[in-house]
């Protein structure tokens, strides 16, 4: 803000002096500026406990500027606003209250809720999902194969995270139990998981649709106490052949 | 010192027009700002609006669509124009100047007129 | 509109009494208020602007106070010549409006 401050000699009548400095248009020794040059604006300068009138090409925080012909000055703001437009329309409130609509509140009003970051009553925002995607491939601790009973998951996405008291999202991913037939291991699959149990022969035509046991088959994955020695292995490998006649695979 | 007259007719008939004028003397009439200010009998003041120092004139929005304030330099004058007025414009017409927000508002004042609409 | 209500509408005084006259604004006017006496059949006086400040040649038992929207004169010790009316204004933002007045009568 352009401050100017009038220093001059009083004339006898209107106590006042039109030869004046910087932004003033007249002045008194005592009062500082008494009115602006056009398009300034007057605003009270405290200085101790003395109030000076001084010009101002835009007007302080918490007042804003009015115009009149011929005669502008810096007008306060509401009690509650910071910074306004005009006395009716804020653009910034005071600590502890809520801008809406130009008005500055203790509590917004119904249907709408206090952002604490910009201060101001906003909309109410709901958690907004996407349609599920499909369900993954029926898996047991990560592998497709060597198993009867295992767990297929779906997800979905979060499109629109609510605000504080938008309704909170639902869940984003869903597991269930599956079953399929089970098909036998590949090479490859084998020698990065390792080898299962003996098994029961699983009954012929059973698939996902099938309502899982409550026991489900262990994994194929080692851990040391299922560790088997070679002559063990070499067994089930004949006992995998003739197996392997039954087994229907399930993608 | 500053001095403020105002001059007119001190009778004027309902629904015709109420015209007074203000002389000046002591300062110009292009610094400051020149009002009316009216009374009626026995209540308060009421404030009309203000001519300034480059012509420019603002009136009381209560008031507005019936008042001109107009000036004439050369007589440093300046003058009040009330249309179609009823017995509620009776009252005591005053003329006053002020310098800015920082100084005395209403420092001067004229002495008065009275004005009775009345038919 | 600002409007300015001003009280008590009339009071009863002795001389030498202390008188308190108060003016509420119906939004804060930033100080921007002055006081007027008025004896009848007469202009209003200027006595008080900006709140406090003192126009030349005004006693100084003249005092004001006041901020926000609620503002008051006061004359330490009333004189015989003080019997008037009084008027508060205020001249924040246009239209100007005046208080309704308050009469100083003598008891």
């Known amino acids: 803000q352009n401050a100017s401050r009038g220093r001059r000699q009083r004339r006898m009548h209107p106590n006042v002096s039109q030869g004046c400095q910087g932004g003033c248009a007249t002045c008194s020794d005592y009062n500082g500026c008494l009115s602006c040059k056009p398009r300034l604006f007057f605003a009270l300068e405290r200085i101790g406990m003395k109030q000076i009138g001084v010009c101002l090409s835009s007007c302080p925080s918490g007042y804003y500027g009015t115009r009149y012909p011929d005669i502008n000055k810096c007008t306060k703001c509401k009690a509650d606003c910071d910074t306004c437009f005009n006395k009716n329309f804020c653009t910034k409130c005071k600590s502890g209250f809520y801008l809406h609509l130009g008005k500055c509140l203790d509590n917004c009003p119904e249907g709408l809720e206090a952002n604490n970051h910009t201060m101001e009553c906003v909309s109410i925002v709901h958690c907004e999902v996407s349609e599920w995607n499909p369900w993954s491939p029926c898996t047991k601790k990560g592998k497709t194969c060597g198993f009867k009973r295992g767990t297929e998951t779906r997800v979905r996405e979060i499109i629109q995270h609510p605000s504080a008291k938008g309704n909170l999202c639902p869940p984003t991913n869903e597991t269930r139990k599956c079953t399929v037939q089970r098909k036998k291991c590949q090479k490859g699959e084998r020698g990065k998981k390792g080898r299962e149990r003996k098994r029961k022969k699983p009954n012929k035509g059973e698939s996902k649709e099938a309502i899982p046991d409550s026991k489900s088959l262990e994994s194929s994955k080692e851990i040391p106490e299922q560790r088997e020695n070679k002559q063990q292995q070499k067994k089930r490998k004949v006992q995998d052949k003739q197996k392997s006649v039954s087994v229907s695979t399930v993608h | 010192e500053v001095q403020l007259v105002e001059s007119g007719p001190g009778l004027v008939k309902p629904s015709e027009t109420l015209s007074l004028t203000c002389t000046v003397s002591?300062?110009?009439?292009?610094?400051?700002?020149w009002n009316w200010i009216r009374q009626p009998p026995g209540k308060g003041l009421e404030w009309i609006g203000y001519?300034?120092?480059?012509?420019?004139?603002y009136q009381n929005p209560s008031l507005k669509s019936r008042v001109t304030i107009s000036r004439d330099t050369s007589k440093n004058q300046f003058s009040l124009k009330l249309s179609s007025v009823t017995a509620a414009d009776t009252a005591v017409y005053y003329c006053?100047?002020?310098?800015?927000?920082?100084?005395?508002?209403?420092?001067?004042w004229g002495q008065g007129t009275l004005v009775t609409v009345s038919s | 509109d600002i409007q300015m209500t001003q009280s008590p509408s009339s009071l009863s005084a002795s001389v030498g009494d202390r008188v308190t006259i108060t003016c509420k604004a119906s939004?804060?006017?930033?100080?921007?208020l002055s006081w007027f006496q008025q004896k009848p059949g007469k202009a209003p006086k200027t006595l008080i602007y900006?709140?406090?400040r003192l126009v030349d040649g005004v006693p100084s038992r003249f005092s004001g106070s006041g901020s926000g929207q609620d503002y008051t004169l006061t004359i330490s010790s009333l004189q015989p010549e003080d019997f008037a009316t009084y008027y508060c204004?205020?001249?924040?933002?246009?239209?100007?409006?005046f208080g309704q007045g308050t009469k100083v009568e003598i008891k």
């Open positions: 006053a100047t002020y310098y800015g927000y920082g100084g005395p508002w209403f420092a001067y």
């Open positions: 002591g300062d110009s009439i292009t610094s400051g700002y």
């Open positions: 001519i300034s120092y480059s012509g420019k004139t």
């Open positions: 939004q804060d006017i930033d100080s921007y």
């Open positions: 900006l709140t406090n």
């Open positions: 204004l205020h001249y924040d933002e246009f239209p100007l409006t």
